[in-house]
């Protein structure tokens, strides 16, 4: 039975060149996890965490997405095709999976700065 | 290698508790889910329940719920089954098992103790 | 709770023979599914993970399939230490074990 529920960053947005945090939180459930899954919107994968292994970060990624904190991941060096869709996939026992998507827009340096003057604190 | 070592067989008296250990050596303890499971003499397996060895949270079954307690010691890598007031239909061997896998396609129990027997009679 | 049916309980076979053990799910479990071996005395051995994957270790001669609700056990010419009885177990939800079934010799 499936309890719990995911929290995410939800959408975001960042200036090209700049770096974001994508976080995932899982609540509400006695389930263990024993791995988390990071995708982008290509389905290829980022990164994974696992309970006894630790991280592994993808080769393609390697330069420009560090581990953490926790269980998130830090994007870094963003480029305008970083844009879209990114998912984390909880492993659970014993519920089963939990998915969570995040979308990331980014701006260009200026737009972003723009943007930023006018959100709200 | 891998293991989970039980303790020893144990003959107790209707009412009695008893305490089962099962400690776990050769990987890290809290990564992996604990499950005990239970099998009277000529029966099937029946699972009771699990312990979330990150968090210390138990789970139980059907049926297993007041008389029955997990626990842990991740200090010493050690997972505890305690029964109290002890019944005849209670006899039994007692298994602690390992949740293997990493993602949810791959869990199975993939390391069990050597179980430990418990006999409750008068 | 998912109930599992094990069938047969009981199979007599003789050295050499294909075995096959067939384990029905109450609901779609996909593959999550497991299967072990337990001899009289020992704990139980896992053989085969996610309704098809061999364990580790585990002879080529048991092969696993299936999906949903309906799988099988399989072991392509049997051996003497094979006589044992064997459980299926879903874990697609809180865990159930099969029956089991016991495979004597003939």
């Known amino acids: 039975m499936m309890t719990g529920t995911i929290e995410t960053t939800g959408n975001i947005s960042a200036k090209k060149g700049g770096s974001v945090i994508l976080q995932c939180h899982l609540s509400s459930t006695m389930a263990q996890v024993t791995q988390v899954n990071w995708e982008q919107h290509d389905h290829s994968l980022l990164a994974i965490r696992n309970a006894e292994l630790g991280w592994h970060i993808y080769p393609a990624f390697k330069d420009r997405v560090a581990p953490g904190p926790g269980l998130g991941l830090t994007l870094q060096s963003l480029t305008m095709n970083d844009t879209g869709e990114y998912f984390c996939t909880y492993h659970t026992y014993p519920d089963g999976t939990y998915r969570g998507r995040i979308f990331l827009e980014v701006l260009e340096s200026s737009v972003a700065e723009h943007s930023a003057r006018f959100q709200i604190p | 290698e891998v293991q989970l070592v039980q303790s020893g067989s144990e003959l107790k008296k209707p009412g009695a508790s008893v305490k089962v250990s099962c400690k776990a050596s050769?990987?890290?303890?809290?990564?992996?889910?604990m499950n005990w499971v239970r099998q009277a003499p000529g029966q099937g397996l029946e699972w009771m329940g699990w312990?979330?060895?990150?968090?210390?949270?138990?789970t139980y079954a059907q049926g297993f719920t007041g008389r029955f307690v997990f626990s842990l010691d991740t200090s010493v890598s050690t997972a505890y089954l305690q029964i109290s007031s002890l019944k005849a239909e209670d006899t039994a061997v007692y298994y602690c098992?390992?949740?293997?896998?990493?993602?949810?396609?791959?869990?199975?129990?993939?390391?069990w103790g050597q179980g430990t027997m418990v006999t409750v009679s008068s | 709770d998912i109930q599992l049916t094990q069938s047969p309980s009981f199979l007599s076979a003789s050295v050499g023979d294909r075995v096959t053990i067939t384990c029905r799910a109450s609901?779609?479990?996909?593959?999550?599914l497991a299967w072990y071996q337990q001899k009289p005395g020992k704990a139980p051995k896992l053989l085969i993970y996610?309704?098809?994957t061999l364990q580790s270790g585990v002879p080529s001669r048991f092969s696993g399939s299936g999906s949903g609700t309906e799988f099988t056990l399989t072991i392509s010419s049997l051996q003497p230490e094979d006589f044992a009885t064997y459980y299926c177990?879903?874990?697609?939800?809180?865990?159930?074990f099969g029956g089991g079934t016991k495979v004597e010799i003939k």
């Open positions: 098992a390992r949740v293997g896998g990493y993602s949810v396609y791959d869990y199975a129990f993939d390391i």
């Open positions: 050769g990987y890290t303890f809290t990564a992996y889910p």
């Open positions: 312990i979330n060895t990150n968090t210390g949270n138990p």
């Open positions: 609901q779609g479990i996909s593959s999550y």
């Open positions: 996610a309704a098809s």
């Open positions: 177990q879903q874990l697609n939800s809180y865990p159930t």
